[in-house]
Amino acid sequence: QKVTQAQSSVSMPVRKAVTLNCLYETSWWSYYIFWYKQLPSKEMIFLIRQGSDEQNAKSGRYSVNFKKAAKSVALTISALQLEDSAKYFCALGE
């Protein structure tokens, strides 16, 4: 299993939307992709989960664009706020 986030940093003005990309590889049939936000304290905050055979996930300002065949799962954060400034991680799990 492998997860790749090619964007090292992104800068975007408030109130705009940003899309963070994540590519993965897996041999699992059934899996989840999780998106987390890391606080300055290093604490990880769960944001949203995408199931491998589910429709695109959405939760508040967070939405996922899931391309299963391409093994791509992008997180879009809309209406950006200053407190969205952070490090974001995607993770793969069964």
């Epitope: 049939w29 059934s30 055979d53 589910e54 996930a57 391309k67 299963k68 065949a69 791509s72």
Partner: antibody, heavy 118, light 106 residues
Framework: QVQLQQSGAELVRPGASVTLSCKAS????????MHWVKQTPVHGLEWIGA????????AYNQKFKGKATLTADKSSSTAYMELSSLTSEDSAVYYC???????????WGQGTTLTVSS | QIVLSQSPAILSASPGEKVTMTCRAS?????MHWYQQKPGSSPKPWIY???NLASGVPARFSGSGSGTSYSLTISRVEAEDAATYYC?????????FGAGTKLELK
């Protein structure tokens, strides 16, 4: 509204190649993969493969590797499938279809009928 | 890849009758999707994620199941329901379809 407009019926000779097209409208083309399916009376519906128009990343059913080549043109919002070394076994109706995440296929083109005959 | 087996291949029913068609998967899947196809037309999404009716599908249709066994039921068949119904899964790496159940009205 979402529409997938496929090219017209084709009659081609054995051994030749053909390219089928699928023009998407009513949504942002690069936000969704485009998949292709083959339908015949004998084998029913068979998944051929898919392309991510944004990146060009493709995935194929092993059965159709070397037979089908998927491409996409972002500027015209059109997906293409080239079928090579055609035989009578390739005679079928081909559909381009758009998935909803990793779930089902919510939009289908009207289909292109391919007939391979000498 | 996961093989989907649909039964019966042909289902004959009278208007008003209750009918059930089944789809069995060679391995366990999380969801099953169903499509309706009439001659000369593309398949239409009919039931998705096992039990959710697609837009415009009459409430007499329902879907159920889990694991390797799924079904589509019509509570009271109407003439317009005559069509072929296909099941589809995408729990494995590639989508697969069943061979279809053709519903004929007497």
């Amino acid at each position: 509204q979402v529409q997938l407009q496929q090219s017209g019926a084709e009659l081609v000779r054995p051994g030749a190649s053909v390219t089928l097209s699928c023009k998407a409208s009513g949504y942002t083309f690069v936000d969704y993969e485009m998949h292709w399916v083959k339908q015949t009376p004998v084998h029913g519906l068979e998944w051929i493969g898919a392309i991510d128009p944004e990146t060009g990343i493709t995935a194929y059913n092993q059965k159709f590797k070397g037979k089908a080549t998927l491409t996409a043109d972002k500027s015209s919002s059109t997906a293409y499938m080239e079928l090579s070394s055609l035989t009578s076994e390739d005679s079928a109706v081909y559909y381009c279809i758009r998935p909803r995440g990793g779930s089902h296929f919510d939009y289908w083109g009207q289909g292109t009928t391919l007939t391979v005959s000498s | 890849q996961i093989v989907l087996s649909q039964s019966p291949a042909i289902l004959s029913a009278s208007p008003g009758e209750k009918v059930t068609m089944t789809c069995r998967a060679s391995s366990s899947v999380n969801y099953m999707h169903w499509y309706q196809q009439k001659p000369g037309s593309s398949p239409k999404p009919w039931i998705y994620a096992t039990s959710n009716l697609a837009s415009g599908v009459p409430a007499r249709f329902s879907g159920s199941g889990s694991g390797t066994s799924y079904s589509l039921t019509i509570s009271r068949v109407e003439a317009e329901d005559a069509a072929t119904y296909y099941c589809q899964q995408w729990s494995s790496h590639q989508p697969t379809f069943g061979a279809g159940t053709k519903l004929e009205l007497k």
